[in-house]
């Protein structure tokens, strides 16, 4: 399927609007510090060039690869070295090394100011004045802050963003209409970004075999009526799509994602009865809907797995003939029977099964050796079940904020070397598992909780990789993708950690505390809590609770005072002294 001009091929397949959006996203994800206007200029130049190639595929440079064309364009940015430092050295390289170099310089935590939401009227005016620029700005701002955001999905978010403004800027109460929609888009966007980041980490750090295993398990849960061959085809196609997007090949990725959606909708009968409502929707919505589709019902009377994978005398023969296919079939069969298990648990079971076969198929009596393999699964299954049960009980007892605090203390004790902002961000997100998953029925709790935790812990791994400070974090993040969560769960108080010296400045607060939103206040308090644990890692729950209660009382008192700043100046040192005494 070769084309004389790749850029013309993609322009024709995607259409001008999606082509321009995807190129903007690609450039914004690579050059995260560049001003918006610079990116728009580059995108317009690329688009004009693409149009010349559509008109004549033999025109000059039209035969060049997309990496070459895009890389050449990025390397024309005048301020590359001043803004990006050593990333400018990428431009001295040839493809494909140049693109790899750009990828390595993507920054998961760019030093960009938080996005401030203007007044609704200001936003509506901007939307009406220049809708196209307004939407491009959205793509740019999200893409540069989330350099691995799933590009075709970001186009879907932009379409929803546009629809929200189109509807709400006409409404009687614009704010009441618009703000909840923007909050929902923000929260969904952050979740989507984090989920995609795990997919890219899986591909980049553990290879496509790891990603394919994840996809087999997940798609088998979603499509339990589909044959193994059908699931395998979907997995192959999905792996290609995500490999492309994670590799910066956003045009190919979006094009292949559209092809996959088309294939799924043309073959619904052999995939799932749940696809019908997705397939009537327009492209972006359809692809999103297919990705989020609920699990189909399990077929009736599925046979026992033990017959083929434990009791059969042919297990070792089948395994030896095609190891990955046999393990893939095992994973497919197990996953389609267990929508109640997390994908990570299913992958652990497949790993345990593989290890047993490796050992037993070399033994004198293989059948005798592997006869009890399913019994060995029991502790692996019970561990996440118990973890979910205990943490949901704790969440229900404490509520979200205090549950987050419990996790902050737990994780700071495990890995106190990690930066405070990272510990706060990760623990707050870990704590959100309660509201997200604990209200679900038993059969949905584990897949919700553990697979969500995997996404959050990947964020910790990604941030830690940029600035490594803890061998324990490095070990949990790099040894095994499927065992990351159990690895972190198993970490105890770090006895080797030398407590952080007390710094009064860390615990000095001002009147600006009082004007903060509830969420910002929580973050301030949680930052103080982490610093407290770093200072006194062996502090008991009771001691920490006492200090945090005093802190809340102190802030509340000063925020009610007439002269707030004076109150903070006077009461602050008292609070610090009392806290030190309580923790002595």
């Amino acid at each position: 399927d070769t084309h004389k001009s790749e850029v013309a091929h993609r322009f024709k397949d995607l259409g001008e609007e999606h082509f321009k959006g995807l190129v903007l996203v690609a450039f914004s994800q690579y050059l995260q510090q560049c001003p918006f206007e610079e990116h728009v200029k580059l995108v317009n130049e690329v688009t004009e060039f693409a149009k010349t190639c559509v008109a004549d595929e033999s025109a000059e440079n039209c035969d060049k690869s997309l990496h070459t064309l895009f890389g050449d364009k990025l390397c024309t940015v005048a301020t590359l070295r001043e803004t990006y430092g050593e990333m400018a050295d990428c431009c001295a390289k040839q493809e494909p090394e140049r693109n790899e170099c750009f990828l390595q310089h993507k920054d998961d935590n760019p030093n960009l100011p938080p996005l401030v939401r203007p007044e609704v009227d200001v936003m509506c005016t901007a939307f009406h004045d220049n809708e196209a620029t307004f939407l491009k700005k959205y793509l740019y701002e999200v893409a540069r802050r989330h350099p691995y955001f799933y590009a075709p999905e970001l186009l879907f978010f932009a379409a929803r963003y546009k629809a929200a403004f189109a509807e709400c800027c006409q409404a009687a109460d614009k704010a009441a209409c618009l703000l909840p929609k923007l909050d929902e888009l923000r929260d969904e966007g952050k979740a989507s970004s984090a989920k995609q980041r795990l997919k890219c980490a899986s591909l980049q750090k553990f290879g496509d075999r790891a990603f394919k295993a994840w996809a087999v398990a997940r798609l088998s849960q979603k499509f339990p009526k589909a044959e193994f061959a059908e699931v395998s085809k979907l997995v192959t196609d999905l792996t290609k799509v995500h490999t492309e997007c994670c590799h910066g090949d956003l045009l190919e990725c979006a094009d292949d994602r559209a092809d996959l959606a088309k294939y799924m909708c043309e073959n619904q009968d052999s995939i799932s009865s749940k696809l019908k409502e997705c397939c009537d929707k327009p492209l972006l919505e359809k692809s999103h809907c297919l990705a989020e589709v609920e699990n189909d019902e399990m077929p009736a009377d599925l046979p026992s797995l033990a017959a083929d994978y434990v009791e059969s005398k042919d297990v070792c023969k089948n395994y030896a003939e095609a190891k990955d296919v046999f393990l893939g079939m095992f994973l497919y069969e197990y996953a389609r029977r267990h929508p109640d298990y997390s994908v990570m648990l299913l992958l652990r079971l497949a790993k345990a099964y593989e290890a047993t076969l490796e050992k037993c198929c070399a033994a004198a009596d293989p059948h005798e050796c592997y006869a009890k393999v399913f019994d060995e699964f029991q502790p692996l299954v019970e561990e996440p079940q118990n973890l979910v049960k205990q943490n949901c009980e704790l969440f229900e007892q404490l509520g979200e904020y205090k549950f987050q605090n419990a996790l902050l203390v737990r994780y700071t004790k495990k890995v106190p070397q990690v930066s405070t902002p990272t510990l706060v961000e990760v623990s707050r997100n870990l704590g959100k598992v309660g509201a997200k998953c604990c209200k679900l029925p038993e059969a949905k709790r584990m897949p919700c909780a553990e697979d969500y935790l995997s996404v959050v812990l990947n964020r910790l791994c990604v941030l830690h990789e940029k600035t490594p400070v803890s061998e324990k974090v490095t070990k949990c993040c790099t040894e095994s993708l499927v065992n990351r969560r159990p690895c972190f769960s198993a970490l105890e108080l770090d006895e080797a950690y030398v407590p952080k010296a007390f710094n009064a400045e860390t615990f000095t607060f001002h009147a600006d505390m009082c004007t903060l939103s509830e969420k910002e206040k929580q973050v301030k308090k949680q930052t103080a809590l982490v610093e407290l644990v770093k200072h006194k890692p062996k502090a008991t729950k009771e001691q920490l609770k006492g200090v945090m209660d005093n802190f809340a009382a102190f802030v509340e008192k000063c925020c009610k005072a007439d002269d707030k700043e004076a109150c903070f100046a006077e009461e602050g040192p008292k609070f610090v002294a009392a806290s030190q005494a309580a923790l002595a």
Epitope: L302, A307, D308, E311
Partner: antibody, heavy 121, light 111 residues
Framework: EVQLVESGGGLVQPGGSLRLSCAAS????????MGWVRQAPGKGLEYIGI???????YYASWAKGRFTISRDNSKNTVYLQMNSLRAEDTATYFC???????????????WGQGTLVTVSS | IQMTQSPSSLSASVGDRVTITCQSS????????LSWYQQKPGQPPKLLIY???DLASGVPSRFSGSGSGTDFTLTISSLQPEDFATYYC???????????FGGGTKLTVLG
């Protein structure tokens, strides 16, 4: 009543193909491995192959490549696809239910009545 | 893999004790994966014995099986008129592809 009924036999020319079906009633096919055995007129029994509950197939060495066993649990039916048929494939073809689920034990405890396949020009 | 049955034919009278042997060129799986069948003209085979010595459901107790590894025996302790038929052994081996039947023993009425 628990039974197996084969169908699809008949006269076929050498080099031709035929698909035999074996429909189960009174029980679910998904709980046992299902095999095919043939018997040439006046001769002994000859094992063709078996399909396990999970769809793994195992064939006698002489049958590999020409014969394919498949199953459709939703239809409670097992199939035997036979290609490149020769005169020596003339036989009564039986489907049978093995005691095991995942492999062939050689112990078939439920048999169909058989369907006659004649390969002749 | 070869399964050799002997004798290939046998004549006996009602009330006789009859023994048929089956020898495999390789040990059967688990040393006991051997079955015995009875077949009458125009009918499918009927399972008599599995795992060398276990009696199949509904089979009279005059039928018994013994043996291990490569050598097996089917014994009918006291022949009944309905027992005149052809008997086959079948062995399961380490691969399901290698299942094989013996050539058969035709049991007829003496005289």
């Amino acid at each position: 009543e628990v039974q197996l009924v084969e169908s699809g036999g008949g006269l076929v020319q050498p080099g031709g193909s035929l698909r035999l079906s074996c429909a189960a009633s009174g029980f679910s096919l998904s709980s046992n491995a299902m095999g095919w055995v043939r018997q040439a007129p006046g001769k002994g029994l000859e094992y063709i192959g078996i399909i396990s509950v999970g769809g793994f197939t195992y064939y006698a060495s002489w049958a590999k490549g020409r014969f394919t066993i498949s199953r459709d649990n939703s239809k409670n039916t097992v199939y035997l696809q036979m290609n490149s048929l020769r005169a020596e494939d003339t036989a009564t073809y039986f489907c049978a239910r093995d005691r095991h689920g995942g492999d062939s034990s050689g112990a078939f405890y439920l048999w169909g009545q058989g369907t006659l396949v004649t390969v002749s020009s | 893999i070869q399964m050799t049955q002997s004798p290939s034919s046998l004549s006996a009278s009602v009330g006789d004790r009859v023994t048929i042997t089956c020898q495999s060129s390789e040990s059967v799986y688990s040393n006991n994966q051997l079955s015995w069948y009875q077949q009458k003209p125009g009918q499918p085979p009927k399972l008599l014995i599995y795992d060398a010595s276990d009696l199949a459901s509904g089979v009279p107790s005059r039928f018994s099986g013994s043996g291990s590894g490569t050598d097996f025996t089917l014994t009918i302790s006291s022949l009944q008129p309905e027992d005149f038929a052809t008997y086959y052994c079948a062995g399961g081996f380490s691969s399901s592809s290698d299942t094989a039947f013996g050539g058969g023993t035709k049991l007829t009425v003496l005289g």
